[in-house]
Amino acid sequence: ASVGLPSVSLDLPRLSIQKDILTIKANTTLQITCRGQRDLDWLWPNNQSGSEQRVEVTECSDGLFCKTLTIPKVIGNDTGAYKCFYRETDLASVIYVYVQDYRSPFIASVSDQHGVVYITENKNKTVVIPCLGSISNLNVSLCARYPEKRFVPDGNRISWDSKKGFTIPSYMISYAGMVFCEAKINDESYQSIMYIVVVVGYRIYDVVLSPSHGIELSVGEKLVLNCTARTELNVGIDFNWEYPSSKHQHKKLVNRDLKTQSGSEMKKFLSTLTIDGVTRSDQGLYTCAASSGLMTKKNSTFVRVHEKPFVAFGSGMESLVEATVGERVRIPAKYLGYPPPEIKWYKNGIPLESNHTIKAGHVLTIMEVSERDTGNYTVILTNPISKEKQSHVVSLVVYVPPQIGEKSLISPVDSYQYGTTQTLTCTVYAIPPPHHIHWYWQLEEECANEPSQAVSVTNPYPCEEWRSVEDFQGGNKIEVNKNQFALIEGKNKTVSTLVIQAANVSALYKCEAVNKVGRGERVISFHVTRGPEITLQPDMQPTEQESVSLWCTADRSTFENLTWYKLGPQPLPIHVGELPTPVCKNLDTLWKLNATMFSNSTNDILIMELKNASLQDQGDYVCLAQDRKTKKRHCVVRQLTVLERVAPTITGNLENQTTSIGESIEVSCTASGNPPPQIMWFKDNETLVEDSGIVLKDGNRNLTIRRVRKEDEGLYTCQACSVLGCAKVEAFFIIEGAQEKTNLE
């Protein structure tokens, strides 16, 4: 009869009837006394109802802690648990009393009209219809309608308990509008009250807070948090908020159902928390919990409250960013601030605007970084409220992997005359400069492009047995000069030269440059020939529309069948500067050319004349001669470059200047063009004539006027002319001071 916390020597209130269950007849008197060791009280069935007037609880005639419960003329509805408990504790003694009333075996509910049972359509859930019995051992079935169905206890999931009611899986009665319990006593049927069946949902799909994160405010601003719960149909939602400052006067909570589209299988509920003027104590975690009774889902967000608007850079803000050409560079503006600042980026003081190559926002993104992106970038943060500004400079250093200048030219596959001294060059541009440039070599025959050997795009030479130039055993005697540094096209470049003291053996030479971000290499074909010799007449690079002759000279006693060819398109795609040698082995790529044969006492000379040379005539020209005895073919290759015709241009301006009498003036006028232009000087539109005071040097590029006189004042013009036209620049020279009088009067 005792319930409570099981513990050592626990003293519970003592009941006068020492039983767990008491069965009494209707219309008799129920009296139970409860004695204890501290203040106690009684609880009885339906003790919230009006029937309470019938129940009398009195103090015993002895004892500090003793109370007697009396109910005269009990009825079936008095059936239930009678509990005597110690106040302010969970310690109690219970007796279950059955008041047997065969005319009403079911205990009526408080309303006596009908009850409501709420169920969820869940296979695993059971529902209890609270038709309690005033008799413990009744045969009870459950009737559901409409359509009418009867459920009988099966000893498993369907059962009836007089203290609890009828238990059945929810889904079995979810179709029904109402249910009731029925008991048979001596062939008589007795029904409990009707229970209306209400199918309720319980599933909460999600609970979303808006804003969901990163909520920042400053003191005095309004906080509005929306909590939206999405549920299945037939769900009621109870919202519960937890937040830091519960004693908030300006807090407002509004809950409402949101309209969903008709036919939607979902309901939406919204709870809005508003705090009109936040204080620092409102900073913290805000949690919204939505509960449907069977399910609770919650979501949280952190609200940060600042004393006042501010802006500052975060500790992770970089000052130096290193990148390699071609990479994507991201420089995030890491800041702390409220509200979020306006962000502006500058490069070397000039504002940056976003375009397809650069995005200037919270993150400065350079899509494909190039050398010209190197520099100082300033990011300025401006607080939109206080207008406070903070700036930070980030230096961007762009590294360039080694690039070898000669690789960009069409590779000279010229042959080199046996026994001559030759210089091979690699001009390297890299940032940072290469920490080393190494030279390697291998014999040409080890690397010959035999038809049986596959040549790939990435590896045009089938061999990879490169040897260090220090080991020139079996090759040409080599000397590597100390690297030189030169300013070429405005860039600091490293020039490495390899001197072949005597061209005795055909070989391949490779220069390899390495810096911290990469490597670059160039392979040079060094084909040595004892055969014919090619010369150009005139001995210079021709310009478009000029005429040029290629002479192939061979010893008549050794060679015969001199023929000129032009090297045609490659049968295989091969890297620029990586043409396989020797060309004699692959005549399919050669185009035969018309030429004129001349002879002198010892040599045959085959001349191929190009009149009005065009850019299309550029390329590699091959002279082939056959050994009279062995019939072996010997090839010599010469690369012909035709310079484009370019109209004259003058680089740099002549500037107006003021000079005092007796001083000197020195000016220069640099012109470029092809053919090279002639430079002429004019004073006041008349040709300037050299005399003792006027000196023209370096092809008239430099003009010097010594000991200027007043009459030297005027408009000076530099004019550069060629067949393609003229270019000119002008400047006015002002001569100050009085002319000294001579004593010739």
Epitope: L10, Q37, R38, D39, D62, G63, F65, R87
Partner: antibody
Framework: EVQLLESGGGLVQPGGSLRLSCAAS????????LSWVRQAPGKGLEWVSA????????YYADSVKGRFTLSRDNSKNTLFLQMNSLRAEDTAVYYC???????WGQGTLVTVSS | QSVLTQPPSASGTPGQRVTISCSGS????????VNWYQQLPGTAPKLLIY???QRPSGVPDRFSGSKSGTSASLAISGLQSEDEADYYC???????????FGTGTKVTVL
């Protein structure tokens, strides 16, 4: 918050009388049994008297039986201890408390001396 | 004259466990429940344990009570300086028809 506030203590001559009161608040007064406990200076606790919630049952220590009377006015949430024929050995701090011991007042000093 | 007997004093160093006994008879501890009280110097007693072993809310779980036959005991585990006080046991006595208190034990934290 439960509060028990004793009053009525003071100096009295041997053979004299005093009426102590205990005003209660913060709980349903008539539901609880109450008692008086005293503590002589430098001594231990001694139970004096107790009364049931309705006032129907009262109990006294042998040392005060016949001299002290305990009563309560549930309408005024007040407990009374009428002390007659006071003796020097009745000198003590008198505490009003729930009989369960859950709550105690701060006590009132009774001094019996000539 | 007290009917329940307690040792006059008990002591321990901080963190130690101290146990106080309370010895009675069949008419009090033997047939009724025991309460334990703590009295700090100059203050009213405070309930520490009721119904032999139940702790009111707010009382640290370092305090525990037990009863066996006609004796009861209070244990303080992990003794702290603020535990320095007088401790009393109490029970209803069926023969005397009233409450009886123990002689009291003074606990000192060394």
């Amino acid at each position: 918050e439960v509060q028990l506030l004793e009053s009525g203590g003071g100096l009295v001559q041997p053979g004299g009388s005093l009426r102590l009161s205990c005003a209660a608040s913060g709980f349903t007064f008539s539901n609880y049994a109450l008692s008086w406990v005293r503590q002589a200076p430098g001594k231990g606790l001694e139970w004096v008297s107790a009364i049931s919630g309705s006032g129907r049952n009262t109990y006294y220590a042998d040392s005060v039986k016949g001299r002290f009377t305990l009563s309560r006015d549930n309408s005024k949430n007040t407990l009374f201890l009428q002390m007659n024929s006071l003796r020097a050995e009745d000198t003590a701090v008198y505490y009003c408390a729930k009989a369960s011991g859950d709550n105690w007042g701060q006590g009132t000093l009774v001094t019996v001396s000539s | 004259q007290s009917v329940l007997t307690q040792p006059p004093s008990a002591s321990g160093t901080p963190g130690q466990r101290v146990t106080i006994s309370c010895s009675g008879s069949s008419s009090n501890i033997g047939s009724n429940t025991v309460n334990w009280y703590q009295q700090l110097p100059g203050t009213a007693p405070k309930l520490l344990i009721y119904l032999n072993n139940q702790r009111p809310s707010g009382v640290p779980d370092r305090f525990s009570g037990s009863k066996s036959g006609t004796s009861a005991s209070l244990a303080i585990s992990g003794l702290q300086s603020e535990d320095e006080a007088d401790y009393y046991c109490s029970a209803w006595d069926d023969s005397l028809n009233g409450y009886v208190f123990g002689t009291g034990t003074k606990v000192t934290v060394l």
